[in-house]
C-alpha cells in the first residue's frame, strides 16, 4: 500500500505477487464522504501506471483489468479529479511480477583444508525478479541435518561454518539446496560426497631446497603439508622459461630428490597436494620458491681467434680474442680466463689470468713457433683449454678463397659469399669470416668479430655487431693444418651518399705536376663503404665544366698526383667521395697556380 490511503483503497486480485503473463484486477474505491465536495457524480477516478494514465471512471469505484505486466515491480496509483481543483492521490499499490525459481543446478561443496569449513555453490538459473530464499541442507552420519538460509538477493554460495573431520572418511554426506518464493519452490538434485571428496588441502608451505655438498646432482626439496596428504605434484622451471617440468610423488612426506636440475640456474618451484589417489581435488599451487642451483665446472671450449701485427724486424704483436661461453657451458660465473703462451721449440711458457676482458694483447719475437691455450674458470674449475698455433693466416696464397663478395641482406645483415681456393678445396678444414669496423689508420682497438664456417659452406650471414651506414673490413680465411690463406673485401648493410667530401689540406708542386693531399672523411660521415674519390678542377673565373679524376678508394691512401694542369694558370680544386648510393657534396675548395714551365 502507498501512503496512508485515508480517502480510499486500492485492492489487487488475485495477489500483489503474480506470475509473468498473468492478469490482475485492480479496484480503486473511495471511502464514504471522500468524493468531490459538491456532487459525487462528478467524481472522476483515474488509474495511473507509474506516471501514465491507463483508465478512468466517474463514480465511487473503478475496476481495471491489467495484462502484460513486465518482470519486476510496477506501481499503480489511483487519483481523484474534481472540477476546478488539482488531482488528489487516493491510494496506490505495487505489483511484483516474477517467476517461480528454477531448479538450482551444479551444486558443489568444498572444504578448504582439513581445518576449513564446508561451503557450497550452485547455479540459480534465471532471475526470479522476486525475493527468493535459498536453504542449504547437509545430511550426514549420526542422523544429523544442517541447514543454512540465505538472505542475499542473489544467493549462489553458502558457508555452513562447520568443519568435516576425517574420523570416518568414507561416510556419506548429502547436500541439497531449495529455492522458495511466493510463486513456488524448487530443489536441486542431491549431491552426495565423502570427506575425501570435498576436502581440498591447503597448498604446501615452508618450501626449502638443500644442495648436499653444494652439488646440483644432490638436490632435495622440502615442504610442509597437512597431515592427511597422500599425493604431491611438483613443478619446476628455469625462471626464464615458460615450460614446467612436472613430477608426481606418493607418500613423499614432505621431501623429494630432484635429479635433472641444471647448474647455476635460477629455478622456480611449486608444489600441490591431494588427499587420495582418485578422490577429491588438488590444492592450489604453493607460493613459488625461487632458488639458484650451485655452480659446476665449465663444459665446452672457448672459441678463440687472433690477429698478428708486424712491429719491426724482430717483434710482432699478437692480439687474442675469445667469445664468452654460453650460460649452459659456463655453468657458473666466470671469474677469469687463463691464457698460456708457449714457444713450442724452446718450451718457454707464460701464463696469465685475465679478468673483465675477452681479449689479450702481447708482443712476442718474430722467430720461433708459438702456441696459445685459453680456458675459462669459475668457482668449481676450468673448461678444457682451446689450443691454437700462431701462424701467418694469409701466407698461403693458394689457400686464399676466391671471388669474395659482400652484399646487404635486410636490416643490419651482410651476406658474404666466396669460392673455394684454387688449391685442392678438400684441403680446407674450416673457413673463418672476420669483420671489424673500417678505421683509417688500422686501429687495433676496434672490436673484432668472427664466425666459423664448415669447409663445405661458401657463404655466411653476418649480423652480430653490424650497424647501418658503417663500412666493415671483411676477411675470409681458409684454414688447413698449419696453413692459412685469406681474401678481404669491404661491405656494409646499408649505405647512402657520404655527408661530406674530403678536406684538401695541402697542394704541392713536384716536377711540373701537383700532389694533392686530403684528410679522410670522418667515419660517421662516410655512410657506408667508399668506392671512389673524385678530384675536380677548373680555371678560376671560368664557366666551363670542371675536369675530374676518379681514384679508387684505398684505406691508407690520402694523396694523389695530377699532371694535366697548365703552368701559370690559377685553378680551383675540390674533392668528393662516392659510395654505391651516390656522391657526397663538395669538400673545401683550394686555389693553386702551377709555377713550372709550359711544355
Amino acid at each position: 500500500k502507498i501512503d496512508a490511503c485515508k480517502r480510499g483503497d486500492v485492492t489487487v486480485k488475485p495477489s500483489h505477487v503474480i506470475l509473468l503473463g498473468s492478469t490482475v484486477n485492480i479496484t480503486c474505491s473511495l471511502k464514504p464522504r471522500q468524493g468531490c465536495f459538491h456532487y459525487s457524480r462528478r467524481n472522476k477516478l483515474i488509474l495511473y501506471k507509474f506516471d501514465r494514465r491507463i483508465n478512468f471512471h466517474h463514480g465511487h469505484s473503478l475496476n481495471s483489468q491489467v495484462t502484460g505486466l513486465p518482470l519486476g515491480t510496477t506501481l499503480f496509483v489511483c487519483k481523484l479529479a474534481c472540477i476546478n481543483s488539482d488531482e488528489i492521490q487516493i491510494c496506490g499499490a505495487e505489483i511484483f511480477v516474477g517467476v517461480a525459481p528454477e531448479q538450482p543446478q551444479n551444486l558443489s561443496c568444498i572444504q578448504k583444508g582439513e581445518q576449513g569449513t564446508v561451503a557450497c555453490t550452485w547455479e540459480r538459473g534465471r532471475d526470479t525478479h522476486l525475493y527468493t530464499e535459498y536453504t542449504l541442507q547437509l545430511s550426514g552420519p549420526k542422523n544429523l541435518t544442517w541447514q543454512k538460509q540465505c538472505k542475499d538477493i542473489y544467493c549462489d554460495y553458502l558457508d555452513f561454518g562447520i568443519n568435516l573431520t576425517p574420523e570416518s572418511p568414507e561416510s556419506n554426506f548429502t547436500a541439497k539446496v531449495t529455492a522458495v518464493n511466493s510463486l513456488g519452490s524448487s530443489s536441486s538434485l542431491p549431491s552426495t560426497f565423502t570427506f575425501l571428496d570435498i576436502v581440498r588441502p591447503l597448498p604446501p608451505w615452508d618450501i626449502r631446497i638443500k644442495f648436499q655438498k653444494a652439488s646440483v646432482s644432490r638436490c632435495t626439496l622440502y615442504w610442509r603439508d597437512e597431515g592427511l596428504v597422500l599425493l604431491n605434484r611438483l613443478r619446476y622451471r628455469p625462471s626464464n622459461s615458460r615450460l614446467w617440468n612436472m613430477v608426481n610423488v606418493t607418500k613423499a612426506k614432505g621431501r623429494h630428490d630432484l635429479l635433472d636440475l641444471k647448474p647455476f640456474t635460477e629455478y622456480e618451484f611449486q608444489i600441490s597436494s591431494k588427499l587420495h589417489l582418485y578422490k577429491g581435488s588438488w590444492s592450489d599451487w604453493s607460493e613459488s620458491l625461487r632458488a639458484q642451483t650451485p655452480e659446476e665446472e665449465p663444459t665446452g671450449m672457448l672459441d678463440v681467434w687472433y690477429m698478428k701485427r708486424h712491429i719491426d724486424y724482430s717483434r710482432q704483436q699478437i692480439s687474442l680474442f675469445w667469445k664468452n661461453l654460453s650460460v649452459s657451458e659456463a655453468r657458473g660465473k666466470i671469474l677469469h680466463y687463463q691464457v698460456t703462451l708457449q714457444e713450442l721449440t724452446g718450451g718457454k711458457a707464460m701464463t696469465q689470468n685475465i679478468t673483465g676482458h675477452t681479449s689479450w694483447t702481447t708482443v712476442i719475437p718474430r722467430t720461433g713457433n708459438w702456441a696459445v691455450a685459453v680456458s675459462a674458470a669459475n668457482s668449481k674449475g676450468s673448461s678444457l683449454p682451446t689450443r691454437i698455433n700462431i701462424m701467418n693466416l694469409c701466407e698461403a696464397g693458394l689457400l686464399a678463397p676466391r671471388q669474395v663478395s659482400a652484399n646487404s641482406e635486410g636490416m643490419d645483415n651482410i651476406l658474404v659469399t666466396w669460392q673455394p681456393p684454387r688449391k685442392d678445396p678438400s684441403a680446407v678444414q674450416e673457413y673463418v669470416v672476420e669483420w671489424r669496423e673500417l678505421h683509417p689508420g688500422g686501429d687495433t682497438q676496434v672490436p673484432l668479430n668472427w664466425l666459423r664456417s664448415r669447409p663445405y659452406n661458401v657463404s655466411a650471414l653476418i649480423s652480430e655487431n653490424i650497424k647501418s651506414y658503417i663500412c666493415y673490413e671483411i676477411r675470409v680465411y681458409a684454414l688447413s693444418g698449419d696453413q692459412g690463406g685469406c681474401s678481404s673485401i669491404l661491405g656494409n648493410s646499408k649505405h647512402k651518399a657520404p655527408l661530406s667530401g674530403p678536406h684538401i689540406n695541402a697542394i704541392t708542386e713536384e716536377k711540373g705536376s701537383i700532389l694533392i693531399s686530403w684528410n679522410s672523411i670522418p667515419v660517421q660521415e662516410q655512410m657506408g663503404c667508399l668506392l671512389h674519390y673524385r678530384i675536380y678542377w677548373k680555371e678560376r673565373d671560368s664557366n666551363s665544366q670542371p675536369q675530374l679524376c676518379e681514384i679508387p678508394y684505398r684505406v691508407s691512401q690520402n694523396s694523389h698526383p695530377i699532371n694535366s694542369l697548365q703552368p701559370r694558370v690559377t685553378y680551383v680544386l675540390w674533392m668528393t667521395a662516392l659510395t654505391a648510393a651516390g656522391e657526397s657534396s663538395h669538400g673545401n675548395e683550394r686555389e693553386f697556380c702551377l709555377q713550372g714551365k709550359a711544355n
Epitope: L144, W146, F160, I162, N163, L164, T165
Partner: nanobody, 125 residues
C-alpha cells in the same frame, strides 16, 4: 562466565505446540554456539538441535521439520519452537552454550561448557 535459564516448559497434548526459551547472561553470548538437549526418565541425555554463531542450524532427524531453533543476539536468547509434539518428546529440556567446531563436535555434550537447569516438557496422549 555465562549463566543460562530455560523457560516455557509444561504439559501439552499430543499434536500441540510449545515454545521453549533460554535466556543467557553475559556479554559474550554471540561468541557461542547454542544447543538444546533433552533427557527422558531412565535414558541418556540426547542432542536435539543447535545453532551456530553464523545461524547455521542443526537438527537430529527425529525432530527435523517439527522443531525450529532460533537465536536473538540482541536479546541474548535462544528459542526452540516445538510443533506436532509426540508423547516420546516427553523429557527435561536443557539449553547449552559452547564452542564446538567440527560436524561431529556439535552433538557431543562434552563440547558445551555452560548448561541451564532444565525445563520439563510433558506430552500426553
Amino acid at each position: 562466565q555465562v549463566q543460562l535459564q530455560e523457560s516455557g516448559g509444561g504439559l501439552v497434548q499430543a499434536g500441540g505446540s510449545l515454545r521453549l526459551s533460554c535466556a543467557a547472561s553475559g556479554r559474550t553470548f554471540n561468541n557461542y554456539a547454542m544447543a538444546w538437549f533433552r533427557q527422558a526418565p531412565g535414558k541418556e541425555r540426547e542432542f536435539i538441535a543447535a545453532i551456530t554463531r553464523s545461524d547455521t542450524t542443526l537438527y537430529i532427524d527425529s525432530v527435523k521439520g517439527r522443531f525450529t531453533i532460533s537465536r536473538d543476539n540482541a536479546k541474548n536468547t535462544v528459542a526452540l519452537q516445538m510443533n506436532s509434539l509426540k508423547p516420546e518428546d516427553t523429557a527435561v529440556y536443557y539449553c547449552a552454550a559452547g564452542m564446538p567446531y567440527s560436524y561431529s563436535d556439535y552433538p557431543r555434550d562434552s563440547k558445551y561448557d555452560y548448561w541451564g537447569r532444565g525445563t520439563q516438557v510433558t506430552v500426553s496422549s
